[in-house]
């Protein structure tokens, strides 16, 4: 099983992925989410299921959550977008975009991150790096630091399998490996990040965690590019 | 602030079932795992399973499969744990655990006829 | 399933002292989590990962091992630290605890 740290991952390089976001319900993590402009922040539209009588924030620049940090700052929200054809009942048009009260200060350790827009497929094989605050272990441990793990992309027709996911990933998802190393609880709305580039954001299904049968589900982000850029327009 | 908020001490005829209750505040259970701990002066403490509150995912000690079922009800953020067909060898204090790190305060559950 | 044995199974420490008890495993195990029960209260929770300590834990508790072996020591003992401390592995289904080691103050 898995050693901790996202699961079979380990801590980030503090302040090193500068467009990582915390979602943040009456103060305290609900899910990750991605700086994708200067006053927006793109995560899983799940996440807010049960944020309905809550207040929604946004923490960026942050590595712990819980020390102080000079470069951490908590932004409420604006606006919430939850992608139109998100489903309480299914991992499609798993996206929302959240607006920022202001802009966000950039500096080293707050800085959007650019995303796909070329749809085209991640090859298999690719490595790519998830990070977030979500659980760390089959115990349900929550971590106070970022976390992150490598993962390979998964073909589609693999992920498909009856014995895996069962056709439920359409062009508009993607897949990586989930032996051991995975994105879990609290890790969703996060990003998956190959070459430097915003690939995919992870779902918020209530998907088993670190099973090799259960790949990790990623929303494709270049299949939602006109949607993104209507809504930050 | 965690806090988990176990229902009251339970006194049990052999042959019997119980079900005991641990309500959640401070933290959503469907964003953890919940599990269950029996303690008795001599068998020590032992890991009865554990819940994904999200999808209602279980795995059992397989010592404890078919004597303890573990459920979770969302909308009250509860976790429950129904002990059947009980003898006195289940009579113990039952813990419920969020992430295996905060403790409930224990229930006492004592089987005598 | 992975048995855990703890030694002692009862120590005693003056104020101030040195306290190591230690946790083996019969197959390696990769983590161990640490818990403190003093009478009459739920366990609470002391060490994560072997080394890591849980929030509000006191500096004097520190936690190390790898494979089979792993060890809990207090660098000064205090009159608080009496208690029942049990080691715990999560690496191996069925999750396991250790019996315990009652530390008493002299």
């Known amino acids: 099983p898995p050693r901790g740290r996202i699961l079979g991952g380990r801590e980030a390089e503090a302040h090193a992925r500068p467009y990582m976001a915390s979602v943040q319900l009456n103060g305290a993590h609900l899910c990750g989410g991605v700086l994708v402009a200067e006053q927006w922040v793109l995560s899983a539209a799940h996440c807010l299921e049960d944020a309905a009588d809550g207040k929604v924030q946004v923490l960026l620049g942050a590595h712990s959550l819980s020390q102080p940090e000079p470069s951490k700052r908590l932004y409420d929200v604006l606006r919430a977008v939850p992608h139109p054809d998100s489903q309480p009942d299914t991992i499609d048009h798993d996206l929302l975009l959240l607006q920022l009260s202001e802009k966000a200060t950039l500096g080293p350790a707050v800085r959007p991150l650019p995303w796909q827009r070329v749809d085209r497929d991640v090859a298999p094989g690719t490595l790519c790096d998830v990070a977030g605050w979500g659980i760390v272990n089959h115990a349900g441990r929550r971590p106070d630091s970022l976390q992150h793990v490598l993962l390979p992309v998964l073909d589609r027709a693999t992920c498909n399998r009856r014995t895996h996911h069962d056709g439920a990933i359409t062009e508009r998802l993607m897949c990586a490996e989930s032996n051991r190393r995975d994105s879990c609880k609290g890790d969703s709305g996060g990003p998956l990040v190959c070459g430097g580039v915003l690939e995919g954001v992870v779902t918020s299904g209530s998907r088993v965690c670190g099973n090799r049968k259960k790949p990790g589900i990623y929303t494709r982000v270049a299949s939602y590019a006109a949607w993104i850029d209507s809504v930050l327009a | 602030e965690v806090q988990l908020q176990q229902s009251g001490a339970e006194l049990v005829k052999p042959g019997a079932s119980v079900r005991l209750s641990c309500t959640a505040s401070?933290?959503?259970?469907?964003?953890?795992?919940m599990h269950w701990v029996s303690q008795r002066p001599e068998r020590g403490l032992e890991w009865i399973g554990k819940?994904?509150?999200?999808?209602?995912?279980?795995k059992y000690d397989p010592k404890f499969q078919g004597k303890a079922t573990i459920t979770a009800d969302t909308s009250s953020n509860t976790v429950y744990l129904q002990l059947s067909s009980l003898t006195s060898e289940d009579t113990a204090v039952y813990y419920c655990?969020?992430?295996?790190?905060?403790w409930g305060q224990g229930t006492s559950v004592t089987v005598s006829s | 399933q992975s048995v855990l044995t703890q030694s002692p199974a009862i120590m005693s420490a003056s104020p101030g002292e040195k306290v190591t008890m230690t946790c083996s495993a019969n197959?390696?195990?990769?983590?161990m989590y640490w818990y403190q029960q003093r009478p009459g209260s739920s366990p609470r929770l002391l060490i994560y990962?072997?080394?890591n300590l849980a929030s509000g834990v006191p500096v004097r508790f520190s936690g190390s091992g790898s494979g089979t072996s792993y060890s809990l020591t207090i660098s000064r003992m205090e009159a608080e630290d009496a208690a029942t401390y049990y080691c715990?592995?999560?690496?191996?289904?069925?999750?396991?605890f250790g019996g315990g080691t009652k530390l008493e103050i002299k």
């Open positions: 715990q592995q999560w690496s191996t289904y069925p999750w396991t």
């Open positions: 197959s390696s195990v990769s983590d």
């Open positions: 819940i994904d509150p999200a999808n209602g995912n279980t």
């Open positions: 990962d072997t080394s």
């Open positions: 401070g933290f959503n259970i469907k964003h953890t795992y």
């Open positions: 655990l969020n992430a295996m790190e905060y």
